[in-house]
């Protein structure tokens, strides 16, 4: 009679993570008598997956009745497959021996490949806010996918970005892989409503890529522009001066009025108006009693935005020496304004 051969008809099997893998094996003869064992890998480090004779293998179920005396089919099913199960599986026939069974013949092996989906991409931006015209970096990470081939793209408001660098780790063979990408984005004043998107495409996703997003509102700081204007005299001896704080983001802002360098009033932006681009406007006004001033008054609107160094704009009020009985002892003149940093 021809010597027993162990046939593993499938050279390779591809299974999605979480599914069940079926590994087939057939012996061509009933002789010699002895059990079948399944191993993953070869050599001294091979791992016992199933022993027909003894042992407890909770993830493995047998497809046919292996206890039947004339059975020559020895397929197994391995449940809840993970990327860690990838490898070559060998069906091995043992010859009954005393005291121990002896390995008799091995099948050629079946390579089990596991397809695992990448995790949802996580996009993270810089730790500190940056102002328009600055370049900031965003990172995107996704883990646990297999096979290694993967495509990653970056978008800003639907427009594909080209300035990015991507790595897939590890470089060598592994049960699963991770991708890490860093993109550079130049901020503009209109980016409060902008979004950066990282898109990952993988064979397991059936053409429906995974996306991770970051809102630039978390990253951008748009510094305000200031304008100080003098309103017409509201009443005798009183001048209304306004400070227009425009196009700032985020909302956190504190304004201080100074009269000749002395703090007059400090307030926090509360009732702001929002612009279409997501930035804010705010106005503060100061009623100046010019009769209380002998000389010209320098009014300064000083703004501290989002914890940054203060910016300011000044306005000079000229106090004229008119006789009081004429009912107008003040002349207000806008002699220009300047913007400067106060540290």
């Amino acid at each position: 009679e021809e010597e027993l051969q162990v046939i593993q008809p499938d050279k390779s099997v591809l299974v999605a993570a979480g599914e069940t893998a079926t590994l087939r094996c057939t012996a061509t003869s009933l002789i010699p008598v002895g059990p079948i064992q399944w191993f993953r890998g070869a050599g001294p480090g091979r791992e016992l997956i199933y022993n027909q004779k003894e042992g407890h293998f909770p993830r493995v179920t047998t497809v046919s009745d292996l206890t039947k005396r004339n059975n020559m089919d020895f397929p197994i099913r391995i449940g809840n497959i993970t990327p860690a199960d990838a490898g070559t599986y060998y069906c091995v026939k043992f010859r009954k021996g005393s005291p121990d069974d002896v390995e008799f013949k091995s099948g050629a092996g079946t390579e089990l490949s596991v397809r695992a989906k990448p995790s949802a991409p996580v996009v993270s931006g810089p730790a500190a806010r940056a102002t328009p015209q600055h370049t900031v970096s965003f990172t995107c990470e996704s883990h646990g996918f297999s096979p290694r081939d993967i495509t990653l793209k970056w978008f800003k408001n639907g427009n594909e970005l080209s300035d990015f660098q991507t790595n897939v780790d590890p470089v060598g063979e592994s049960v699963s892989y991770s991708i890490h990408s860093t993109a550079k984005v130049v901020l503009t004043r209109e980016d409060v409503h902008s979004q950066v998107i990282c898109e990952v495409a993988h064979v397991t996703l059936q053409g429906d890529p995974l996306r991770g997003t970051a809102n630039l509102s978390e990253t951008i700081r748009v510094p305000p522009t200031l304008e100080v204007t003098q309103q017409p005299v509201r009443a005798e001896n009183q001048v209304n001066v306004t400070c227009q704080v425009r196009k700032f983001y985020p909302q956190r802002l504190q304004l201080t009025w100074l009269e000749n360098g002395n703090v007059s009033r400090t307030e926090t932006a509360s009732t702001v108006t929002e612009n279409k681009d997501g930035t804010y406007n705010w106005m503060s006004w100061l009623l100046v009693n010019v009769s209380a001033h002998r000389d010209d008054v320098k009014l300064t609107c000083q703004v501290e935005h989002d914890g940054q160094p203060a910016v300011s704009k000044s306005h000079d009020l000229k106090v004229s020496a008119h006789p009081k009985e004429q009912g107008s002892n003040t002349a207000a003149e806008n002699t220009g304004s300047n913007e400067r940093n106060i540290y």
């Epitope: 001294p44 480090g45 091979r46 002896v102």
Partner: antibody
Framework: EVQFQQSGTVLARPGTSVKMSCKAS????????MHWVKQGPGQGLQWIGA????????TYNQKFKGKAELTVVTSTSTAYMEVSSLTNEDSAVYYC???????????????WGQGTLVTVSA | DIQMTQSPSSLSASLGERVSLTCRAS??????LNWLQQEPDGTIKRLIY???SLDSGVPKRFSGSRSGSDYSLTISGLESEDFVDYYC?????????FGGGTKLEIN
């Protein structure tokens, strides 16, 4: 009781070969991989390779491929290692040890031979 | 190849003292690590297998543990016969590799 009896000390000339033995007793020889380990004078341990007596399947550390050749005679439960093209670098104590026919934690390198000292000298 | 970095390479200690030897694996080896003891005459004996399982006949003062990629052998209460050489060995992946060894000397 499991025991490995290794052959005695060898003094060899550079360029020649030596063949040492490791006789196993006390268990089924064919259920285990036989491994060989090198220890140079005052140095650490280096795994050379292993052989499976059932089918003479061998696996080597790349560093020792072409330098060491592993064989077995199952009828006498003896493993052999031949080291060829000897140089001073091959002067060492060579140990045999074993692991189970699959990766069973409890069976890795439990039992060791007493070692064979090889001295290469002109 | 997986590198096993063993530290310290030598250690002086006193009788009754508690000492720890460490091996760091360059790649993941799970729990597949042995600790071996080598006598001055060359005799090798396994003390610990699978990171923390004590071999039969090995005194309970020997114990093994793991923290991430660091594997430790602790001897609590050194006795005179413990002042010998110790090696770790990974058997997770071929080629199987040993740590450089630790020589434990009496103070």
């Amino acid at each position: 009781e499991v025991q490995f009896q290794q052959s005695g000390t060898v003094l060899a000339r550079p360029g020649t070969s030596v063949k040492m033995s490791c006789k196993a007793s006390g268990s089924t020889f064919t259920s285990y991989w036989m491994h060989w380990v090198k220890q140079g004078p005052g140095q650490g341990l280096q795994w050379i390779g292993a052989i499976y007596p059932v089918n003479n399947d061998t696996t080597y550390n790349q560093k020792f491929k072409g330098k060491a050749e592993l064989t077995v005679v199952t009828s006498t439960s003896t493993a052999y290692m031949e080291v060829s093209s000897l140089t001073n670098e091959d002067s060492a104590v060579y140990y045999c040890t074993r692991s189970f026919y699959y990766s069973l934690d409890a069976a890795w390198f439990v039992y060791w031979g007493q070692g064979t000292l090889v001295t290469v000298s002109a | 190849d997986i590198q096993m970095t063993q530290s310290p390479s030598s250690l002086s200690a006193s009788l009754g003292e508690r000492v720890s030897l460490t091996c760091r694996a360059s790649q993941d080896i799970g729990s597949r690590l042995n600790w071996l003891q080598q006598e001055p005459d060359g005799t090798i004996k396994r003390l610990i297998y699978a990171t923390s399982s004590l071999d039969s006949g090995v005194p309970k003062r020997f114990s093994g543990s793991r923290s991430g990629s660091d594997y430790s052998l602790t001897i609590s209460g050194l006795e005179s016969e413990d002042f010998v050489d110790y090696y770790c060995l990974q058997y997770a992946s071929s080629p199987f590799t040993f740590g450089g060894g630790t020589k434990l000397e009496i103070n």
